[in-house]
Interface confidence: low
């Protein structure tokens, strides 16, 4: 993303990670007799279909890659660049996705890549100059590795380690919203829906026809991308004649507010631009669509209300399960916010601790989100996705119930099934008081520190809310500690 | 409460069969890999067999490979374990436990049942 | 089969004193940041307890003067300060692979 990163965070440090929670479920896989084997534990039951020929196929993969069992099983999704070339990146370069195939896998993940976006000329020439991976297609490598949700190790990825992968990077700066082609009057192409919808047609003779489930994911840009085009993309299969696939949303770090900025400042640039002021411009820059059911809900020209996460969800026919940081870095960049190492003031406290009562109030009724009380920003691709909890539950432990939501009766069930939720949303109030947040490290030191560390390098005046608590500050210092 | 109870324990002779059972409660059976560990007399812990949450892999130690056939019925919560061809080695207090659907670790164990082979 | 050394195979220790117990794997039991191996208690006539996972997380209930740490092959059950009711077998294990093996077991005696 374009914004200033304050904190670095786990994954992109060289130091020994914290200690990590746990990891999922996974049936063992044996290892052979005497055989020095990397192995590790494997979740059979994520298979589907028929066993016999799965362990045949198992079998016949394993006797073909003994010579070589040194070597790690290729985990690459690779580059397929649109047959269709007048779907296009910004510079008319053709837009394209990255698949694994899981031959014994009717689940298809789609994830659509954040990162932004640019809004007038001005911008989104800056953009091409300093991103143009995030407008071009022209230097993208031919393979990706798949991380977090798109990994198909069991152990980084519990919830759908098994299923087929696509990745498709975004090359639109649109918001995935725009269906304009590039011409004389446009300098930039913005197609990111006509992106999305391309790719599916493309995946149908690739297998995504013999789908049981979609589940369009994607983080950030991609997270509101998944908000605005998950209807469209259902509509699109009963179209072409596959009704039966069920089309389900993953939207992380992509519900934003249309809220009042810390400190109103001009729409210069990106990521100083209130939100909505953004989105107005950005809709029209782009030829921007919005869901049919929501766009009828506001009148002409009020469309950019349908970008916004707690506006669009309620008109959605296709279940979403919404992943969003109480406190969203991207969120804060935008209401000026800046978090530059030095203490906050008291008012930017304040609004800080509002932002997060307020994201909390609009997931009230969102069926299923997962949303934990920390700094952060976008993290169902992070390796470490497995290690945040919210009230003892992991994310990909909530996505299983999710899931299983679905088997329970053909309806999605409202009620989450006794020790299995899908609902959870952080209820403490500060920046970290969830002690699975992905860990803090001073910009300048590269130090990790603990919460009482990072609120009070923030300007937390413990005393002050000690006593609004009515408890002693030492109690307080304590319970931060231990992240209560 | 989460709990799990073995029961089926007793003593038998050299090549006879025992069937051992573990009741489960407390929680979702049918989300969880289940094992069976046996401790002999005096002696440290050993890995039985292992079945996934549903029962599609199943897994022995090589020791009892051919001779125990570990199985469950989900909709009664129950986790089995039929013994054949018992011997002298096979005592020992037999444990199932969960296995936490994070990691590879044992979360709950049963009280544990005693088999004991003898002539 | 990745086997697990323990040591000392018994250790007295006076109440409030701490206990160092280790567990030596022949083989690596950490990837991708991951250590797969946990601590359980045992005690006459009970099951196994968990007490830590995946090297060092305490499990949910368990006091806070048992914690573990270490990577690779190397691995530490610390308990301080030790109480009267420590006293018991104590056995590492790992889940790298099948078979999940224990160590040999460490008694515990309080002096």
């Known amino acids: 993303s374009e914004g200033r990163k304050t904190w670095r965070r786990r994954g992109q440090q060289p130091p020994q990670p914290p200690p990590p929670p746990p990891l999922p479920q996974r049936a063992e896989v044996e290892p052979g007799a005497g055989q020095p084997v990397e192995s590790f534990p494997l979740d059979f039951t994520a298979v589907e279909g028929n066993m016999d020929s799965f362990m045949a196929q198992v079998k016949s993969l394993a006797q073909s890659l003994y010579p070589c069992s040194a070597q790690q099983l290729n985990e690459d999704l690779r580059l397929h660049l649109l047959l269709n070339t007048s779907v296009t990146c910004n510079d008319g370069s053709p837009a394209g996705y990255y698949l694994k195939e899981s031959k014994g896998s009717r689940r298809w993940l789609l994830f659509l890549e954040g990162g932004w976006y640019c809004f007038n000329r001005e911008n989104c020439d800056s953009r091409y100059d300093t991103m143009r991976r995030l407008m071009s297609s022209k230097d993208w490598p031919h393979t990706r590795t798949g991380t977090g949700i798109l990994s198909s190790q069991p152990e980084e990825n519990p919830h759908w380690w098994n299923a087929n992968m696509v990745f498709i990077p975004y090359c639109s700066s649109d918001v995935w919203s725009g269906a304009s082609p590039k011409s004389d009057k446009n300098e930039y192409a913005f197609m990111g829906s006509l992106i999305i919808q391309e790719v599916v047609r493309e995946l149908l003779g690739k297998g995504l026809s013999g789908a049981k489930v979609l589940l369009l994911a994607g983080s950030s840009a991609g997270g509101t991308g998944v908000l605005l085009n998950v209807d469209r993309v259902a509509e699109l299969l009963e179209e072409l004649g596959y009704p039966s696939i069920q089309v389900r949303g993953l939207a992380d770090s992509g519900w934003f507010l249309d809220n009042k900025q810390y400190r109103r400042s001009d729409c210069i640039d990106t990521i100083n631009c209130a939100p909505t002021d953004a989105i107005r411009r950005g809709i029209r820059y782009w030829s921007g669509m919005v869901p049919e059911r929501c766009q009828r809900q506001f009148k002409e020209g009020e469309e950019w209300n349908c970008f916004f996460g707690y506006k669009v969800y309620p008109t959605l026919r296709c279940p979403v399960f919404v992943v969003q940081w109480l406190f969203d870095e991207a969120q804060l960049t935008v209401d000026n916010v800046h978090l530059t190492g030095q203490p906050v003031q008291e008012g930017q406290w304040l609004y800080i601790q509002n932002l997060g009562r307020e994201l909390r109030g609009t997931l009230k009724d969102v069926q299923a989100s997962f949303a934990p009380a920390c700094l952060s920003h976008e993290i169902i691709i992070r390796s470490y996705w497995t290690d945040v909890q919210v009230k003892g539950t992991s994310l990909p432990r909530a996505l299983h119930c999710w899931d299983r939501s679905f088997h329970d009766s053909h309806k999605a069930s409202k009620t989450p099934m006794k020790g299995c939720p899908f609902h959870l949303v952080d209820s403490c109030p500060w920046p970290h008081c969830n002690p699975s947040c992905p860990t803090i490290r001073d910009q300048f030191t590269g130090q990790e520190m603990n919460v009482a560390q990072f609120l009070m390098h923030m300007g937390f005046d413990v005393q002050t809310v000690a006593q609004q608590q009515g408890m002693e500050p030492s109690k307080l210092l304590g319970m931060l500690s231990n992240g209560n | 409460e989460v709990q799990l109870v073995e029961s089926g324990g007793g003593l038998v002779k050299p090549g006879g069969s025992l069937k051992l059972s573990c009741a489960a409660s407390?929680?979702?059976?049918?989300?969880?890999?289940m094992h069976w560990f046996r401790q002999a007399p005096e002696k440290g812990l050993e890995w039985v067999a292992y079945?996934?949450?549903?029962?599609?892999?199943?897994y022995y130690a090589d020791t009892v490979k051919g001779r125990f056939t570990i199985s469950r019925d989900n909709a009664k919560n129950t986790l089995s374990l039929q013994m054949t061809s018992l011997r002298s080695e096979d005592t020992a207090m037999y444990y199932c436990?969960?296995?936490?659907?994070?990691?590879?670790?044992?979360?709950?164990w049963g009280t544990g049942t005693t088999v004991t082979v003898s002539s | 089969d990745i086997v697990l050394t323990q040591s000392p195979a018994s250790l007295a220790v006076s109440l409030g004193q701490r206990a160092t117990i280790s567990c030596r794997a022949s083989?690596?039991?950490?990837?991708?940041?991951?250590?797969?191996m946990h601590w359980y208690q045992q005690k006459p006539g009970q099951p196994p307890k968990l007490l830590i996972y995946?090297?060092?997380n305490l499990e949910s209930g368990v006091p806070a003067r048992f914690s573990g740490s270490g990577s690779g092959t190397d691995f530490t059950l610390n308990i301080h300060p030790v109480e009267e009711e420590d006293a018991a077998t104590y056995y590492c294990?790992?889940?790298?692979?099948?078979?999940?093996?224990f160590g040999s077991g460490t008694k515990l005696e309080i002096k």
């Open positions: 294990q790992h889940s790298r692979e099948l078979p999940p093996t």
């Open positions: 079945i996934s949450s549903g029962s599609r892999t199943v």
């Open positions: 436990a969960r296995k936490h659907y994070n990691g590879g670790y044992f979360d709950v």
């Open positions: 083989k690596i039991v950490s990837t991708s940041g991951y250590s797969y």
């Open positions: 407390g929680f979702t059976f049918s989300d969880y890999g």
């Open positions: 995946l090297a060092s």
